[in-house]
């Protein structure tokens, strides 16, 4: 799902008080519900009907460094008999989320949000095709 | 997927520098490729076979102040005809994201990343069925 | 009523190039997978390439006699589908058959259209 | 890539029951499409999804696959139905004919 645009004021002071220098604000260490963790059933990559591969990157300079992308083994979906069946479609399902990018120069460190897309796995739709006049 | 905890040293200084000054760092405003948009198909909520509703939590102290949620409509996946088979399971797909958390005091405004659980969609996959003896 | 209506067909000499189109009418085109399928004189059927739908990124399959020297590609708002036939042989000498065949999610009913094909010869 | 192995001609007489078979190690994985052609017309798809069959398309043909066997079988074949008989697989690594069968309606 989609992440609003930054323009509007959430990052700002109150209109009353003096405006935050240098174009920066001040970000506390931590992570709130650090230790809350997914649960999803067990193996559903391969399970699913639209099954999807894993493919992580990597990157030291971005928080979480390791970001994983899923990718949609088929173009069909696989029925019941193990079998590929291309009339309904295996697509995937993204996300917009934020990660946290680390820029330094020397003893001078900042960070910067950046939004990255994330591809979460896949789902199998049938494709809307019908006759028309 | 799983963000790993923060405790490593993301957002430490080098060993040689002097530390952050009361446990807070700086955050440049702005949000780096944030015209970056999601490209999912069409409806694909409505067209799964294991389809899912949205349901929008909101919060104007959180960034982005919406989240949407998805809950599959079924516990079964729908079939070519348009009927639940319960032969098969919808289940949800889950992502750790990050969101920042405003949190002022009159004009002293900080803010804190926090971990949200996001579901994201729902696929249809093959129950485990264990046979015991 | 569907309509599949291939067009470009000629004669032409090995080396040459050659673009077929396909224009389609009566269903949702762009939702549908197409296909290109020919037909060598008193021979069997053979599967020349395929385009897929937005849903699936119209990820583009060859055949591997073809590969590399043909190019399908596709414009969903005039409804046609393309075949760019570079490098060509005389073993490419055909009728080319635009296909579709797909679940009509309104009728219930799996269905399949051809055009009426287009001649290709490759001869000197 | 894989091979869809059929025989060139299967002859029947009328009001018999005709079996076209289609071999290829890879059927067990694979969904088969069976399609009618006639000559100088456009191919017909007969039988979808192993044995699924159109609407518009008569009881009389039926598939099966098994194995490494599909198979379309035609009960109480009339004169019409003599034509060319395809075999055909369609998945994410794209898609393969067999080499056609003749049916001859004695």
């Known amino acids: 799902r989609k992440i609003p645009k930054v323009g509007h004021t959430f990052f700002q002071k109150p209109e009353s008080c003096p405006p935050v220098p240098g174009g920066s604000m001040k970000l506390d260490i931590g992570i709130i519900n650090e230790n809350q963790r997914v649960s999803m059933s067990r193996n559903i990559e391969s399970r699913s009907t639209s099954p999807w591969n894993y493919t992580v990157t990597w990157d030291p300079n971005r928080y979480p460094s390791e970001v994983v992308q899923a990718q949609c083994r088929n173009l069909g979906c696989i029925n019941a008999q193990g079998k590929e069946d291309i009339s309904m479609n295996s697509v995937p399902i993204q996300q917009e989320t934020l990660v946290v990018r680390r820029k330094h120069q020397g003893c001078s460190v900042s960070f910067q949000l950046e939004k990255v897309l994330v591809t979460v796995g896949c789902t199998c739709v049938t494709p809307v095709i019908h006759h028309v006049q | 997927r799983k963000i790993p905890k923060v405790g490593h040293t993301f957002f430490q200084k080098p060993e040689s520098c002097p530390p952050v000054p009361g446990g807070s760092m700086k955050l440049d405003i702005g949000i780096i490729n944030e015209n970056q948009r999601v490209s999912m198909s069409r409806n694909i909520e409505s067209r799964s076979t294991s389809p899912w509703n949205y349901t929008v939590t909101w919060d104007p102290n959180r960034y982005p102040s919406e989240v949407v949620q998805a809950q599959c409509r079924n516990l079964g996946c729908i079939n070519a005809q348009g009927k639940e088979d319960i032969s098969m399971n919808s289940v949800p797909i889950q992502q750790e994201t990050l969101v920042v958390r405003r949190k002022h005091q009159g004009c002293s405004v900080s803010f804190q990343l926090e971990k949200v659980l996001v579901t994201v969609g729902c696929t249809c996959v093959t129950p485990v069925i264990h046979h015991v003896q | 009523e569907v309509k599949l209506e291939e067009s470009g067909g000629d004669l032409v000499k090995p080396g040459g190039s050659l673009r077929l189109s396909c224009v389609a009418s009566g269903f949702t085109f762009g939702t549908a997978w197409m296909s290109w399928v020919r037909q060598a004189p008193g021979k069997g059927l053979e599967w020349v390439g395929r385009?897929?739908?937005?849903?699936?990124?119209?990820?583009?399959d060859y055949a591997a006699p073809v590969r590399g020297r043909f190019a399908i590609s596709r414009d969903d708002s005039k409804a046609t589908l393309f075949l760019q036939m570079n490098s060509l042989k005389t073993e490419d000498t055909a009728v080319y058959f635009c296909?579709?065949?797909?679940?009509?999610?309104?009728?219930?009913?799996?269905?399949?259209?051809w055009g009426q094909g287009t001649v290709v010869v490759v001869s000197s | 890539s894989y091979e869809l192995t059929q025989p060139p001609s299967v002859s029947v007489s009328p009001g018999e029951t005709a079996r076209i078979p289609c071999s290829g190690e890879t059927l067990p994985k694979k969904l088969v499409y069976w399609y009618q052609q006639k000559p100088g017309q456009a191919p017909v798809l007969m039988i979808y999804?192993?044995?699924e069959r159109p609407s518009r398309i008569s009881e009389r043909f039926s598939g099966s696959n098994s194995g490494t066997m599909a198979s379309l079988t035609i009960s109480g074949v009339q004169a019409e139905d003599e034509a060319d008989y395809y075999c055909q697989t369609s998945d994410s690594s794209g898609v393969v004919f067999g080499g056609g069968t003749k049916l001859t309606v004695l």
């Open positions: 999804k192993d044995s």
């Open positions: 385009i897929s739908n937005k849903d699936t990124g119209g990820r583009i």
């Open positions: 296909t579709t065949n797909f679940y009509d999610v309104l009728t219930g009913d799996h269905v399949d259209y």
